[in-house]
């Protein structure tokens, strides 16, 4: 049967009808509505927005829309005792203080409840000491400082520039180096694009602009007080000393005007090379401490933020499937913002809203999807992916048995150059086929497909004539679905032409200047890029929910497994003496990948030939496809990261935003030459190869003929 027959609908209700119903003007209107006041997690304003979205989704025609609430640990500045950083002289007098707030953008001067810049979950404290400049505070930056330059950060306050890696990793690295405080700042080299004006005259970061953000190292735990379980009414909560992922030293963010005042006085060692220099007119000396004339001056932090258990609200909408109501395709994105959320998250939430409206319109005309579609507006994403994770923890048994796919819908844009997609290999062919059917919004590509402009502007490094699709990392709400539960996941947005700055975000990220006007004036005046992202996200959901055979191609997993096995083998072979001494063999892994490739190929042949009119066989084949991602889950999780359970992919241990392949083996090999017990270290490498090989082989066997 065709999908139209399967769901008993008229032929006009196909993908085209759904896509044609999506309108740029509606996305624009929704974005405006969602960005007029702040919607910080845990606040009354964000609760009211949740209720508004619930009401509108019901009006749009969803079968049910419920609020799911949880009481989780959040963090707020003290309203009467502001956070700031000082330079103090030898008498302890404060001779310079950093600003207490960002100058509000035009038109927003009278808005109340704008949270001042702060690092969420910073402990309280007033450390004082000498400053050490640590570049981006990456693992390799601390290696350079400690091993090459012999600079000791113990007892120092470190200052690091934002960018390259997740801020929580910076703080973790600083803690491990013995620092007693961390100052984070935005350097113009990373957050000021040449030839563009500062907001409000352009999309660049002004000197008084500051990036907010959490500094947790949760490793997928969700609410720090209830790891593994939902933060519901009868939850048992850990004490704060046992909470997961909290930083142990004070942390505070500043803008580049204030950073200039701290960095211009720096003495000590010169920067090791040009990669440590930003764009400020300062020497970028590493320190420790200030130069000659100012050597008696110190830096003092004043941090008074508090951690509070606070109620948060997810909105969960359901569109029941006509044929397979017990199979769930989920579209989710967050609603909470640091301030106005002009890009993050409301450019995504507005797109979700329009997708819900389009699906609702079709439903009102008598259509239903084959499978159930769940729509989610997550809360407290900015505080550690808390809303999505708590909901998934509460519903894990349903999700692991019924979850077909999760499509993420945070910011729709981080630029306006080309498409960016990160997803499971199972979705590669879906994304390719869909983008071939969509029109490109790009200038110079009129009448061409999105696939064509995307491939031209962002070509695959491996396969000519194909676009780049990246690995899923973390830092967004797909994390629990993919990394913990093994549900096939994907995300899409429009991005910049700035590959070298991949993880630094756009200049106004998490600042007060992320407004509706930023988007409407500078990024997407016609909302054509938003519309394209709506078509990609919505089109993926439509196909996943409505195609008779799930649009997953297991052969693409075989291709990447081979690539990842080759890569990790090459990394390991950089230690040939130890490989030989400890008899480290990748034979089992290559053999498992070979078996997976052959079995996936045979499965794909059977998928072409089977009788699709037999509902039992159809369901059986679809279940094998649905459960393939699940087969890569190790119930024991990765070493010291129990909620990262996917054996093929995990967030990098050095950058939460980035994905790492064969992470267990990768981490076992990382910096192995510095391990005190090489025999034990190489034993762990061998164990991780064994786990990976077993998992790949076991996953392959789920695709074999069932009997």
């Amino acid at each position: 049967k065709s999908s139209n027959e399967a769901t008993n609908i008229t032929p006009k209700h196909n993908m085209k009808a759904f896509l044609d119903e999506l309108k740029a003007e509606n996305i624009k209107k929704f974005l405006y509505n969602f960005t007029q006041i702040p919607h910080l997690a845990g606040t009354e304003q964000n609760f009211q927005l949740a209720k508004q979205i619930q009401s509108q989704w019901k009006e749009f025609g969803l079968d049910s829309v419920e609020l799911a609430h949880y009481d989780v640990l959040l963090s707020y500045p003290n309203k009467t005792h502001p956070n700031y950083i000082s330079i103090i002289n030898e008498d302890g007098n404060e001779i310079f203080n950093t600003s207490l707030f960002e100058p509000p953008p035009p038109g927003y001067e009278n808005v109340s409840d704008i949270v001042p810049p702060f690092s969420a979950f910073s402990p309280q404290g007033m450390p004082e000491g000498d400053l050490v400049y640590v570049n981006y505070a990456r693992t390799e930056d601390f290696f350079k400082l400690e091993r090459d330059m012999k600079i000791n950060c113990s007892g120092k306050i470190v200052i690091a520039r934002y960018g390259k890696v997740f801020r929580g990793n910076k703080v973790k690295n600083a803690q491990l180096a013995g620092a007693k405080g961390v100052i984070l700042y935005s350097d113009p080299a990373d957050y000021f694009a040449p030839g563009v004006k500062s907001y409000p005259d352009g999309w660049n970061l002004p000197g008084g602009g500051v990036q907010r953000g959490n500094i947790l190292n949760l490793n997928g735990a969700g609410d720090p007080l209830t790891p593994g379980y939902p933060a519901n009414e009868y939850a048992y909560r850990r004490g704060i000393a046992e909470a997961v992922g909290l930083p142990s030293i004070p942390v505070h963010p500043i803008g580049y005007y204030d950073a200039q005042k701290l960095l211009e006085k720096m003495g000590g060692s010169a920067p090791p090379d040009s990669s440590w220099r930003g764009s400020l007119k300062v020497p970028y000396n590493v320190g420790p401490g200030f130069t000659g004339n100012f050597s008696t001056q110190k830096v003092k932090m004043h941090i008074h933020s508090t951690n509070e258990v606070t109620r948060i609200y997810n909105v969960i909408g359901t569109l029941r499937g006509a044929v397979e109501p017990d199979r769930y395709v989920i579209l989710g994105g967050h609603r909470d913002s640091w301030v106005f959320g002009g890009i993050d998250p409301q450019s995504g939430a507005a797109v979700v809203h329009e997708i819900v409206r389009s699906f609702g319109t079709l439903k009102k005309e008598g259509w239903r999807p084959r499978r159930t579609i769940l729509f989610a507006s997550w809360d407290a994403e900015e505080f550690g992916l808390l809303g999505s994770t708590e909901w998934a923890e509460e519903n894990s048994r349903l999700l692991q048995e019924r979850g077909v796919a999760y499509i993420n819908a945070d910011s729709s844009i981080e630029g306006n150059y080309t498409l960016r997609v990160d997803c499971t290999p199972l979705m590669y062919s879906l994304v390719h086929n869909l983008t071939k059917e969509l029109k490109s919004p790009d200038e110079g590509f009129e009448g061409k497909s999105l696939y064509e402009s995307w491939t031209k502007k962002s070509p695959s490094p491996e396969f000519s004539g194909m676009p780049r699709i990246s690995k899923l990392g973390s830092g967004n709400d797909f994390e629990v679905f993919f990394q913990r539960l093994g549900i096939a996941s994907g995300r899409a947005r429009y991005t910049k032409n700035w590959e070298t700055n991949k993880f630094s975000g756009y200049p106004l990220y998490h600042s007060v200047y992320e407004t509706y006007e930023l988007v409407e004036k500078f990024y997407d005046p016609m909302f054509k890029y938003h519309l394209t992202v709506a078509q990609v996200r919505g089109g993926m959901v439509f196909e996943l929910a409505n195609s008779i055979v799930l649009p997953f191609d297991c052969r693409d997993y075989a291709v990447v497994l081979r690539k990842y096995a080759d890569k990790i083998y090459s990394i390991s072979m950089k230690h040939p003496q130890e490989m030989k001494t400890y008899s480290v063999s990748f034979d089992s892994l290559f053999s498992a990948v070979k078996n997976f490739t052959e079995i996936a190929s045979k499965f794909s042949e059977r998928l072409q030939d089977f009788d699709k009119s037999n509902p039992i066989v159809l369901r059986m084949m679809n279940d094998q496809l649905m459960f393939l991602e699940r087969a890569f889950i190790d119930p024991l999780g990765l070493p010291d990261r129990p909620f990262y359970r996917h054996v093929i992919y995990a967030p990098s241990s050095h950058n939460k935003y980035a994905g790492e392949s064969f992470p267990g083996i990768y981490d076992a090999l990382f910096d192995i030459e510095s391990k005190v017990d090489p025999s034990k270290a190489w034993g762990e490498v061998k164990r991780q190869i064994y786990v990976a090989a077993f998992t790949v082989q076991a996953a392959a066997e789920t695709l074999s003929e069932v009997a």
């Epitope: 096995a565 080759d566 890569k567 072979m573 030989k580 034979d587």
Partner: nanobody
Framework: EVQLLESGGGLVQPGGSLRLSCAAS????????LSWVRQAPGKGLEWVSS????????DYADVVKGRFTISRDNSKNTLYLQMNSLRVEDTAVYYC??????WGQGTLVTVSS
């Protein structure tokens, strides 16, 4: 039984070139990544280069990058290492390695004037 047989070594002047070959048998050649590893006289083993299933995925040690090229011919079950702009410090026994535990017997490359 896995067998790896290197050939192509010899004496060459600095700046010269050599092409090493490694004929493989006893396993599904195209299913494995392969490497070249070398051992200079009196020194430890040093990784030189690795290659994935096809010639698109290659990796080189910094000291040989831009001078050496690894390649494979899956139809001939053979791995190659093209070595250009050879230096005295490239003098070593070069080994072909499969999966980390299967090594060839090596071929000696001597770079000397």
């Amino acid at each position: 039984e896995v067998q790896l047989l290197e050939s192509g070594g010899g004496l060459v002047q600095p700046g010269g070139s050599l092409r090493l070959s490694c004929a493989a048998s006893g396993f599904s050649f195209s299913s494995y990544a392969l490497s070249w590893v070398r051992q200079a006289p009196g020194k430890g083993l040093e990784w030189v280069s690795s290659i994935g299933e096809n010639n698109a995925t290659t990796d080189y040690a910094d000291v040989v990058k831009g001078r050496f090229t690894i390649s494979r011919d899956n139809s001939k079950n053979t791995l190659y290492l093209q070595m250009n702009s050879l230096r005295v410090e490239d003098t070593a026994v070069y080994y072909c390695v499969k999966d980390g535990v299967h090594w060839g017997q090596g071929t000696l490359v001597t770079v000397s004037s």
